[in-house]
Interface confidence: low
């Protein structure tokens, strides 16, 4: 622990004026792990004048930094770059004549206490006035600065010509883009002092490059990835006083992909789970043993979770029987393409028969089965069960459903008793 300081596993405090410290305290290599330090308190250190760029970087867990009644004159711009956990800073009664917002802009500070410093009245500290104005009244501090006459004036009264917040205005083409294409965003910034322009693209995956010239900037995004759909892109104008930003959301259109399709699981209903990605939202169509599956209130598609361009859902089946065993294929399509994926589903064996070894059926009943006019139609009043007899389906003028005679008496079927008069015997 440095001379004139005391250290614990989480705290460093340097309050003894003699002999005092001349540099920001650093721990010896084999002492406490600096990452565990959450609080540093420095007081009465008249010879501590500077916080250098690398003085504080080792204390990545630092939450509270207090330097009071000391000689602090200068803080390097990047001094707190690595200290993202900092919440409370107290620089009361030091020798600071200026302090830039660049020191703190990346921090989520709860407190920044700066009373008792001999600030010079200039545009450099106008950001403090702006900060004070946004705070609720109990949180405000009595900050003063020395004017040209070396008179103390309240920061609240500070008026500096040509010293105001900047503005940013984003001119972007309609940011609905097809995957793989490119787009250029244009941004104009203004203000006095002249702001710098930068782009905040967050975790954008797509390749992007920017060009900036004074008050104009462009961001070129090339070979746009579908992973970037829904992401926000911001143009930021920043000067001494503060910053402004203008944002747009990126929408990427791309062909569907069925990323997940699995065998049925049984909960309250039976469910064939799937995940589909695509934008615009893909239309979904199921096929059963190669034929279109006519959805009804007994067999229907349910989307349970929508995550922007990803859809998680089920083909939900109410009390399926052995007659619903077979191959289920999901097709997803939009104007950019389509995808199909298939699974084999086995809900149960035939009553009294080992389905695995004897898949032959007794005499069956047929029901006409016509294609719905609308994909995903769940209003169809019919409640047919898809056929499991693939060979028999192959050359039919009308697609037909199969129902085993043995099953007609059961109550837990997808066919209700009222519908039985619709069936004709073959």
């Amino acid at each position: 622990c440095p001379t004139s300081c005391k250290c614990s596993s989480a705290r460093i405090w340097c309050t003894e004026p003699s002999p005092g410290i001349v540099a920001f305290p650093r721990l010896e290599p084999n002492s406490v792990d600096p990452e565990n330090i959450t609080e540093i308190l420095i007081a009465n250190q008249k010879r501590l004048e500077i916080i250098n760029e690398d003085d504080v970087e080792a204390y990545v867990g630092l939450r509270n930094l207090t330097i009071v009644d000391s000689g602090l004159k200068f803080v390097a711009y990047k001094a707190f770059l690595k200290n993202s956990n900092l919440r409370h800073i107290n620089f009361t009664r030091n020798k600071l004549t200026s302090l830039s917002r660049r020191h703190f802009r990346h921090l989520d500070l709860s407190d920044l206490i700066l009373t008792g410093n001999p600030f010079t009245c200039s545009c450099d500290i106008m950001w403090l006035k702006t900060l004070q104005e946004t705070k609720s009244s109990p949180d405000t501090q009595d900050l003063y600065c020395l004017n040209e006459s070396s008179k103390n004036m309240p920061l609240a009264n500070l008026q500096i010509p040509n010293c105001g917040l900047p503005s940013a205005r984003l001119a972007a083409p309609n940011l609905t883009v097809e995957e793989g294409k490119s787009v250029t965003l244009s941004c104009s910034v203004g203000g006095d002092p002249l702001p710098t322009l930068y782009w905040d693209v967050g975790n954008l995956v797509s390749k992007h490059m920017n060009e900036t010239s004074h008050t104009q900037g462009s961001l070129r995004i090339t070979n746009i990835s579908s992973d970037d759909s829904g992401k926000q892109i911001s143009c930021v104008a920043e000067n001494l006083v503060g910053e402004d930003q203008d944002s747009v959301n990126l929408t990427v259109h791309f062909a569907p992909t069925i990323t997940f399709l699995e065998s049925p699981t049984s909960d309250h209903h039976w469910c064939i789970p799937f995940t589909v990605r695509g934008n615009p939202k893909p239309a979904l169509q199921w096929f059963y043993n190669g034929a279109i599956l006519n959805e009804s209130k007994y067999i229907c598609t349910k989307i349970h979770v929508t995550n922007h361009t990803e859809y998680h859902g089920c083909l939900q089946l109410d009390n399926p029987t052995h007659m619903n065993n077979g191959d289920y294929t999901l097709m997803a399509k939009n104007e950019y393409g389509k995808d199909e994926r298939q699974i084999s589903a086995h809900f149960m064996g035939r009553p009294g028969v080992d389905y695995e070894t004897n898949p032959n059926y007794p005499e069956v009943l047929y029901e006409d089965w016509t294609t719905p006019t609308d994909i995903g139609d769940t209003t169809n009043k019919s409640n047919e069960i898809p056929s499991t007899d693939v060979a028999d389906q192959s050359n039919r003028e009308h697609e037909q459903k199969l129902i085993s005679e043995e099953d007609l008496g059961g109550e837990q079927k997808l066919i209700s008793e009222e519908d039985l008069h619709h069936h004709h015997h073959h």
């Epitope: 883009v177 294409k181 250029t184 244009s186 490059m209 060009e211 104009q216």
Partner: antibody, heavy 119, light 112 residues
């Protein structure tokens, strides 16, 4: 004065490749996108692609992917377009054009390079 | 891809006359927030390279005579020459820069 000086006319055989140059003067090459445009005889203009001279990043018209390759030499302030596997369909005048105001419009054009593909 | 259609393909007028030519895009070129249309007009005189006349659909490029006026928004655009001069003999192209770049087929202006 901004100028884009293109290389001279080319007569090449089918199947060959050709590299057309465009030397920029009067401005800094890296300040603007460089675009390439094709004009077949008596026909309209077709955008081929553009290049960011700072980092060589390119965008292409789908039609010209695999046909055209855009590059720059910053040291000589020159942009290049190479055309490969040439056929008579590639016979045309090719222009380089500076992309101004974020490359939304082309404010300065080269004088054009005439390419003739003939056996 | 955005398709640009120009009409007429050619027209002949006498010097001093007013002339208009049309350009239509297959989708809107308007940025709703900035109210800017991503459309430009170019002039190509015989044996010369194209020259930028109008950008953002209606902004005249510096040095372009004020007899050239661009108008329109969304998908329908017009180039007007208020009083045609002999030196205006050229082909006029519109171009969109909304999604990549596409040129129209051109309008040939002849002087009677």
């Amino acid at each position: 004065e901004v100028q884009l000086q293109q290389s001279g006319p080319e007569l090449v055989k089918p199947g060959a490749s050709v590299k057309i140059s465009c030397k920029a003067s009067g401005y800094t090459l890296t300040d603007y996108y460089m675009n390439w445009v094709k004009q077949s005889h008596g026909k309209s203009l077709e955008w081929i692609g553009d290049i960011n001279p700072n980092n060589g990043g390119t965008s292409y018209n789908q039609k010209f992917k695999g046909k055209a390759t855009l590059t720059v030499d910053k040291s000589s302030s020159t942009a290049y377009m190479e055309l490969r596997s040439l056929t008579s369909e590639d016979s045309a005048v090719y222009y380089c054009a500076r992309g101004a105001y974020y490359s939304n419009y082309f404010d300065y054009w080269g004088q054009g390079t005439t390419l003739t593909v003939s056996s | 891809d955005i398709v640009m259609s120009q009409s007429p393909s050619s027209l002949a007028v006498s010097a001093g006359e007013k002339v208009t030519m049309s350009c239509k895009s297959s989708q809107s070129l308007l940025n709703s927030r900035t109210r800017k249309n991503y459309l430009a007009w170019y002039q190509q005189k015989p044996g010369q390279s194209p020259k930028l006349l109008i950008y953002w659909a209606s902004t005249r490029e510096s040095g372009v005579p004020d007899r050239f006026t661009g108008s329109g928004s969304g998908t329908d655009f017009t180039l007007t020459i208020s009083s045609v001069q002999a030196e205006d003999l050229a082909v006029y192209y519109c171009k969109q820069s909304y999604i990549l770049f596409t040129f129209g087929s051109g309008t040939q202006l002849e002087i009677k």
